[in-house]
Interface confidence: low
C-alpha cells in the first residue's frame, strides 16, 4: 500500500472593500505551510453586495450593516466551517466614506458602528472596520499588483530566494470617488505626505503615492454634470438624442461639486438636460477639472500636487480597465498609444445615442457616460500624470493578475496578517524533489 499525501491545510482571509458605489467581498486562501512565499495567496471567491456603497446609508446606518448579510452568508459557505474562527475578517472603506467623514463625521461613525455590529455577529476573526487613507489605498493596490506578479522576490530552482531583476510595476487605480497613482521612484519626495518607505522581504522600496479625492469616475461625472448645468443648457459629453431629468439635489449634495454649486437652488427641482455629442466642448469641460496654474514644488502633476516623473511600467486597473476595455472590446477601437486613446475618446464622443445603442446593445446603464469617462482617462494620463507616448507604452490595462482581482484589498490583508515579512526568509528553503 502507498501512503496518500494529504493536501496542505489552507488558511483563509476575508476583506470587504467598501467602495463609494458598491461593496465587494474577497475571500483569499493560501497554504498554511507557505505563508511567507510570494504570490502564494490567491482569491478563493468573491461576492458583490447588492445596492450602493455603505456611505449611501448615511441616513440609515443600520441598513449599511444589513446590506452585507448576503455576502457574509456566502462566506460561511465558502470558508470551511473548521476554519471560521481562524479566518481574519476586515472591512476597509475608501473615498466614499472619506467624503462622508468630511461632510458628516457623525454619520460616518454611525455607519462604521452599524457595519461593525453586523460583522461581529459572524464566527470569523473580525479585526476591524475602518476608513482607509488615500495613501493606504494607493500603496496597498501597488503591493497587491506586485505581489501577484511576483515582483518582490522569486524562489530559484536551487532553493534560494532572490530578488528578480525586473523592477516593480506602478499602479493606477480609478475608483468611484478617488483615483490613486503609486510607483517606485528614486527621486526624493519634495512632499513628505506622498512618500512611503516600505521594507518587504528584506528589500527597501521608496514609493511615491497620491490619491486625488473627487477624481474617481462617479464624482468626475457628477462634476462634469454640474459644470454642464452651470455653463451650457446641454451636456457636450452626452450623445445627441440622449436626454434625462437631473435632480439638482443629487448633483449638488456631493462635496466634490461644491465649486459649481449655485448660491441658492431648489434641491428637489428637476432640470431636463440633453446631450450634444460634442467632443471638443467635452474636452474643454474635462480640462476644467485639472489646474496647472500653481506648483509649489519643482514639478507637479496637477492641482499643485508634487509628482516625480512617471517611471517604469504600470498596471491600470478598476475603472481604468473598464473604460479602456469598453473602447477596445465594445467599440472595437485601437488604444495602444496615447494618440489612439485620444482618437478613441473623440470617436465615442462623436456618436449619437442611436449609434451607440446600435453598437453596444444591452448595455444601457452607463452608455451615455463612456465619452466623458474616456476623455477623462485620456486627459488624466497625458496631461494630469504626464505620460508621454513612450511611458504610455508601458501601461497595461488589466483587472486581474493570477486569477485575483487587482485592488487594495489583498495588499491590505497581506499587511495586516503579516503575510509579507519585512525581512527575507532564511537563506535556503528546503527543496522538495518528490
Amino acid at each position: 500500500t502507498r501512503d496518500i499525501r494529504e493536501p496542505p491545510a489552507l488558511k483563509y482571509g476575508i476583506v470587504l472593500d467598501a467602495g463609494s458605489s458598491h461593496t465587494s467581498m474577497f475571500i483569499y486562501k493560501w497554504p498554511a505551510d507557505k505563508e511567507n512565499d510570494t504570490g502564494i495567496v490567491g482569491q478563493h471567491s468573491s461576492c458583490d453586495v447588492p445596492g450602493g456603497g455603505i456611505s449611501s446609508y448615511a441616513d440609515n446606518p443600520s441598513g449599511a450593516g444589513q446590506s452585507l448579510v448576503g455576502c457574509l452568508e456566502q462566506a460561511l459557505r465558502d470558508v470551511p466551517k473548521e476554519r471560521h474562527a481562524g479566518t481574519p475578517l476586515y472591512l476597509g472603506a475608501t473615498a466614499g466614506m472619506r467624503l462622508l467623514n468630511l461632510t458628516n463625521p457623525e454619520a460616518s461613525t454611525s455607519v462604521l458602528t452599524a457595519v461593525t455590529h453586523t460583522l461581529t455577529q459572524y464566527p470569523f476573526d473580525f479585526r476591524g472596520a475602518r476608513i482607509l487613507s488615500g495613501q493606504e489605498e494607493g500603496v496597498f493596490g501597488w503591493v497587491t499588483a506586485n505581489y501577484l506578479l511576483e515582483n518582490f522576490i522569486k524562489y530559484g530552482w536551487v532553493g534560494r530566494w532572490f530578488r528578480p531583476r525586473k523592477g516593480t510595476l506602478g499602479a493606477m487605480d480609478l475608483g468611484g470617488a478617488s483615483t490613486q497613482i503609486t510607483f517606485e521612484t528614486t527621486s526624493p519626495a519634495e512632499d513628505r505626505a506622498s512618500e512611503v518607505q516600505l521594507r518587504l522581504y528584506g528589500q527597501h522600496y521608496r514609493v511615491y503615492t497620491h490619491s486625488f479625492l473627487c477624481y474617481g469616475r462617479d464624482q468626475v461625472l457628477q462634476r462634469l454634470l454640474a459644470s454642464a448645468l452651470q455653463t451650457h443648457s446641454f451636456h457636450p459629453c452626452w450623445p445627441r438624442g440622449f436626454s434625462t431629468h437631473v435632480l439638482l439635489g443629487d448633483v449638488y449634495q456631493s462635496p466634490c461639486t461644491v465649486a459649481q454649486r449655485p448660491q441658492t437652488f431648489n434641491s428637489s427641482a428637476r432640470v431636463s438636460l440633453s446631450g450634444s455629442s460634442d467632443p471638443h466642448l467635452c474636452r474643454d469641460l474635462v480640462s476644467g477639472l485639472f489646474s496647472f496654474s500653481s506648483c509649489p514644488f519643482s514639478r507637479c502633476s496637477f492641482n499643485g500636487v508634487f509628482q516625480p516623473p512617471v517611471a517604469g511600467n504600470f498596471i491600470a486597473f478598476s475603472a481604468f480597465f473598464y473604460t479602456v476595455n469598453f473602447l477596445r472590446t465594445s467599440m472595437g477601437l485601437p488604444v495602444a498609444t496615447l494618440q489612439q486613446l485620444e482618437a478613441a475618446a473623440v470617436n465615442v464622443c462623436n456618436q449619437t445615442w442611436a449609434q451607440l445603442q446600435a453598437r453596444v446593445p444591452g448595455q444601457q446603464a452607463h452608455l451615455a457616460d463612456y465619452c466623458a469617462g474616456a476623455m477623462f482617462v485620456q486627459q488624466l494620463l497625458s496631461r494630469g500624470y504626464g505620460f508621454d507616448e513612450r511611458a504610455f507604452g508601458g501601461v497595461i490595462f488589466q483587472k486581474k493578475a493570477a486569477d485575483t482581482a487587482v485592488g487594495w484589498a489583498l495588499g491590505y490583508m497581506l499587511n495586516l496578517t503579516n503575510l509579507i515579512p519585512a525581512d527575507p526568509p532564511g537563506l535556503r528553503k528546503g527543496t522538495d524533489f518528490s
Epitope: L102, E136, G138, V143, T209
Partner: antibody, heavy 125, light 106 residues
Framework: QVQLVQSGAEVVKPGASVKISCKAS????????MDWVKQAPGQRLEWIGD????????TYNQQFKGKATITVDTSASTAYMELSSLRSEDTAVYYC??????????????????WGQGTLVTVSS | EIVLTQSPATLSASPGERITLSCSAS?????IHWYQQKPGQAPRLLIY???NLASGIPARFSGSGSGTFYTLTISSVEPEDAAVYYC?????????FGGGTKLEIK
C-alpha cells in the same frame, strides 16, 4: 522653525465664555489638522477635538461637545477654541497641538508633533 | 473609550540606571506614542508608533509592545530625564492618554 504660539492666561467668571488662540508658523497651516488638549490640575491629558483647516471641519470628543467650539482663520494661520458656560472644573491648561503623521505601509499613524506653550484658563468668581 | 493605565505612578531612579515604564490598555490598540512633560512645559513627543524615536530624542529612549501592553525604556537615566511620561493611543476614538508616570532622579 515650526512653532505654535498661544494667547495669554485668562481669568473668567463662572457661566462666561473664553476664546483662546493658537498662531502657527513655519509650515503650511492647511496641511495639518490642529488638535486641542486639556490638562486640568492633577488630571490626565484629555483630547478635546480637532479641526481640518483645509476643509474647516471639526471633530470633537463626545465629552466636550457643547463645551468647546474649534474654528480657524486660515488667512492668519490661527486656530481658535471657544469654551462656553464655564465652571470651576474647566480650570485647566489648554494646549493646541499640530497633528503630525508617520507613513508606514501607506498607513497614516497620527501623533502630536508640535505643541503650543499652553494657555491657563482659571474659572473663578 | 480605551483607558490607558500607566505604572508605576512615581518612579525614583539614580543616574545611569536602566528603567522601564509600562502602559496597559483596556483593549487592544495598534500602536501608542509616548510624550515627556517637564514642569511648566508643554508635552514633547518622545516616541511615536510604539518604537520610533522622535526627532532630536536621544537613543537611550526606546519603546516596544503590542496589543494591550507597551513599555518605554530609558537605558541609562540622565538627570534631565526628570519629567512626567505619558502614553497616548490613536487607535480608537476618542484618542486617550495614560495617567502618567512621574520620574524623579535621586
Amino acid at each position: 522653525q515650526v512653532q505654535l504660539v498661544q494667547s495669554g492666561a485668562e481669568v473668567v467668571k463662572p457661566g462666561a465664555s473664553v476664546k483662546i488662540s493658537c498662531k502657527a508658523s513655519g509650515y503650511t497651516f492647511t496641511d495639518y489638522n490642529m488638535d486641542w488638549v486639556k490638562q486640568a490640575p492633577g488630571q490626565r491629558l484629555e483630547w478635546i477635538g480637532d479641526i481640518n483647516p483645509k476643509y474647516d471641519i471639526s471633530t470633537y470628543n463626545q465629552q466636550f461637545k457643547g463645551k468647546a467650539t474649534i474654528t480657524v482663520d486660515t488667512s492668519a494661520s490661527t486656530a481658535y477654541m471657544e469654551l462656553s458656560s464655564l465652571r470651576s472644573e474647566d480650570t485647566a491648561v489648554y494646549y493646541c497641538a499640530r497633528r503630525g503623521f508617520f507613513l508606514y505601509y501607506g498607513i497614516n499613524y497620527y501623533y502630536f508633533d508640535v505643541w503650543g506653550q499652553g494657555t491657563l484658563v482659571t474659572v473663578s468668581s | 473609550e480605551i483607558v490607558l493605565t500607566q505604572s508605576p505612578a512615581t518612579l525614583s531612579a539614580s543616574p545611569g540606571e536602566r528603567i522601564t515604564l509600562s502602559c496597559s490598555a483596556s483593549s487592544s490598540v495598534s500602536y501608542i506614542h509616548w510624550y515627556q512633560q517637564k514642569p511648566g512645559q508643554a508635552p514633547r513627543l518622545l516616541i511615536y508608533s510604539t518604537s520610533n524615536l522622535a526627532s532630536g530624542i536621544p537613543a537611550r529612549f526606546s519603546g516596544s509592545g503590542s496589543g494591550t501592553f507597551y513599555t518605554l525604556t530609558i537605558s541609562s537615566v540622565e538627570p534631565e530625564d526628570a519629567a512626567v511620561y505619558y502614553c497616548h493611543q490613536w487607535s480608537s476614538y476618542p484618542w486617550t492618554f495614560g495617567g502618567g508616570t512621574k520620574l524623579e532622579i535621586k
